[in-house]
């Protein structure tokens, strides 16, 4: 019998303890928000917010500018000063709750926990390849705002998500805020609203449209807004909230809320329950039919997918897909099965399900007993009636009122439970060549870059490395700048190449040369490396 090379086990062909050092920035405090800007002319910036301060970094993560955003009432607060002589409210630290780009101006908008959740607009001023912030404009007109009606009160101390959409000659802010009774009583930011930025940057236009958790439900019914994004004709919010207004408030599930990005109206506000499950290939005795539910969304990101994953999801290459990391409960603690699962929801399918739900509610014959839902926002009613009414009047349309779609959208873990004990805390998905890669941050401060495929019984790693020595959780929000992703962990911002930090973790030549083309790996004497690391021979074609 012919002698054959002993086969190296797949796991032994890589070493995830290899240290990679990636560029980083120490922010001087826990990073609260981060956003990136890439201009038309090669200028770019990273904006990093910590308590009472906003940093402007160049693309090399070197500090360009720093601005004091608090404490409110402190003479050193540079943003507060934009609102004229104070006092403007109770003194206190400013935690940044919103940091978004208004691409139409372009400008950076920051909103904090202090000063009634007001926002500040910072025009971007390019200087070479760097960007500076102009003097802030205070988006607050005192005479327009009252505790019960405050167009300029945007951020909630409990959390706010904002997506900015340009419509016509204005920027519309799609805002979703977590509320409780105390927050709602003091300059209520509302749960969901669409606000038009005034042309003179003095605040937001009055008379904005909004939905809010009804006062009677504020104590028991809390909505966490996990993510928001704009694609195609819609803006989407992802929420974690109690499954029912009347039942146990600790029984949570995940919903997608859809709003029109072309009409600043809330009549076509729709919600759909997202159901993510772990369905092991061999079902254990006692395991639930259809798989184990993972009802709580932890992080999400939407991205167009590469050819291979598109085929597996039965959609076209390049179509937008919403990816979510789900856990079993708020604490994300261990249960049977993996700690985190990843589910994929094609956006076109989500839209189709929503549209079908509207048809079921509004097109006769309507199934008797079908509820409009969203009883935490509006009076209970049955389809096709408007909220709180027994019947449709001739001049109202069933479609012009918010609706919870009666069916849910169910998917199973793309990774087949292979994430195991890993607790994923951050997610960003990119398409590289025809490959779709999930870039994940973890509870213990690691980065996992893994190809998204569902047909395998092992994970295809681009990389798996530790960001630093602190082991602090990687934060939820990830930003892209060119060919890099920016992750925050503790008080640090790290810049990770989307094609991976390097190739040294591939231990064998065979494994090295089988790495994805985009990684640029080659065999370099006795190690796997990128060409720039190799002064001598570098081989991508065959092993010695």
């Amino acid at each position: 019998e012919d002698w054959q090379c002993p086969r190296t086990p797949y796991a032994a062909s890589r070493d995830f303890d290899v240290k990679y050092v990636v560029p980083s920035f120490s922010a001087g405090g826990l990073v609260q928000a981060m956003v990136t800007y890439e201009g038309d002319r090669n200028e770019s910036a990273v904006f990093v917010a910590i308590r009472n301060r906003l940093h402007v970094l160049g693309p090399d993560l070197k500090s360009v500018q720093s601005l004091a955003t608090g404490p409110a009432g402190d003479p050193g607060c540079q943003t507060c000063a934009a609102c004229g002589p104070g006092p403007h409210g109770p003194p206190g630290d400013t935690d940044t709750k919103v940091l978004v780009l208004d691409p139409a101006l372009p400008a950076l908008v920051s909103c904090g926990s202090s000063l009634q959740g007001r926002c500040f607009l910072h025009d971007l001023e390019p200087q070479g390849t760097a960007v500076h912030l102009a003097a802030p404009a205070c988006l607050f007109s005192a005479h327009h705002n009252r505790p019960d009606d405050c167009p300029d009160c945007v951020a909630s101390p409990l959390g706010t998500r904002v997506t900015v959409v340009e419509q016509g000659q204005a920027s519309y802010f799609y805002v979703a805020s977590s509320l409780d009774a105390a927050v709602a009583a003091s300059f209520s930011p509302r749960s969901v609203s669409i606000r038009r930025l005034k042309a003179d940057a003095s605040g937001f236009a009055p008379g904005f449209v909004a939905l809010s958790v009804l006062p009677k439900h504020l104590v028991s019914y809390s909505i966490e807004y996990v993510h928001s994004f704009h694609t195609g004709a819609f803006v989407y919010f992802l929420t974690v909230q109690p499954a029912s207004v009347t039942d146990d408030p600790s029984a949570l599930h995940t919903r997608l809320a859809r709003l029109s990005a072309t009409e600043p109206e809330l009549g076509d506000y729709r919600e759909l329950v997202l159901d993510c499950r772990f369905a092991p290939k061999r079902r254990r005795r006692g395991a639930p039919e259809g798989g184990q539910p993972y009802p709580v969304l932890r992080v999400a990101h939407s991205a167009p997918v590469g050819a291979q994953l598109a085929t597996e999801l039965s959609i076209a290459e390049g179509q937008e897909v919403l990816f979510g990391v789900f856990v079993t409960g708020k604490d994300g603690g261990p249960g049977v099965g993996p700690n985190s699962v990843v589910c994929a929801f094609p956006i076109d399918l989500l839209d189709t399900l929503i549209d079908e739900g509207v048809e079921r509610c509004c097109e006769s014959p309507v199934h008797p007993g079908l509820r409009r839902g969203l009883d935490f926002f509006q009076s209970p009613s049955f389809c096709p009636n408007p909220p709180g009414l027994e019947a449709l009047s001739p001049n109202t349309s069933c479609r012009h009122f918010p609706l919870l779609v009666s069916s849910s959208f169910s998917r199973v873990d793309l990774f087949n439970g292979l994430l195991g004990p890993v607790q994923v805390t951050a997610l960003y998905v990119t398409r590289l060549d025809n490959v779709t890669v999930a870039h994940m941050g973890t509870m213990d401060g690691r980065i996992l870059q893994v190809e998204l495929v569902r047909s395998l019984n092992y994970l295809l790693y681009v990389s798996n490395f530790s960001l630093g020595d602190s082991g602090q959780p990687v934060q939820r929000d990830v930003s892209r700048l060119g060919d890099h992703l920016l992750f925050a962990s503790g008080d640090q911002v790290f810049q990770v190449p989307i094609q991976g930090p390097g190739c040294r973790h591939f231990l064998t030549c065979g494994r090295c040369l089988r790495a994805w083309h985009f990684m640029g790996c080659g065999w370099c004497g006795n190690m796997c490396g990128q060409q720039k690391e190799c002064p001598g021979s570098w081989q991508q074609d065959h092993c010695p």
């Epitope: 139409a104 340009e166 016509g168 000659q169 042309a199 940057a201 009409e263 600043p264």
Partner: antibody, heavy 121, light 107 residues
Framework: QIQLQQSGPELVKPGTSVKISCKAS????????MNWVRQKPGQGLEWIGR????????RYNEKFRDKAILTVDTSSSTAYMQLSSLTSEDTAVYFC??????????????WGQGTSVTVSL | DIQMTQSPASQSASLGESVTITCLAS??????LAWYQQKPGKSPQLLIY???SLADGVPSRFSASGSGTKFSFKIDSLQSEDFVSYYC?????????FGGGTKLEIK
Amino acid sequence: QIQLQQSGPELVKPGTSVKISCKASDYTLTDFYMNWVRQKPGQGLEWIGRIYPGTDKTRYNEKFRDKAILTVDTSSSTAYMQLSSLTSEDTAVYFCARSAYYGNYVAMDYWGQGTSVTVSL
Amino acid sequence: DIQMTQSPASQSASLGESVTITCLASQTIGTWLAWYQQKPGKSPQLLIYAATSLADGVPSRFSASGSGTKFSFKIDSLQSEDFVSYYCQQLYNTPWTFGGGTKLEIK
């Protein structure tokens, strides 16, 4: 009634600059955006950019960012567009046009009569 | 940038007939669309805003429909002064863009 009165035709040499004006009457200039639009001979319309006279904030079509500078003089209710480094490709009629809200929507509801700019040796 | 494709580029019709012009947007723009008429040597004049609403003083023989990416503009009972050029324009995202125009000619 509302009018936008533009300056007269210009015959200019290549490489030079020209500044054309648009005087607004019967409305408050600072309350509405002012847009500028180009129409080359025998061709369609191209949006150059807009300015909000209340704050001097501008928004340009990237194609014209190095070509046009929009300004206003609120004291005379006049908007200006300066075109620089002129070539024969810049020969066109240039319109100013006010944009206004109609409910939630926007349209360019009043237009100047146009200023013809001819770039020639 | 959002591309606006207007067709036909030119159309011949007789007095009293109806004509329809279409405009396709390269991405959804809701109803952020306007239609303009331009007479030779003159500035454009607003006819339609918000895709379907008639501007003040515009005769009711002009009408328009559509939303999302597909829009149409119709003139009923053509009159001699209608044989000029027409443009659609999206005002959803900057840069605001126009269709290539349609020139109506008398048959």
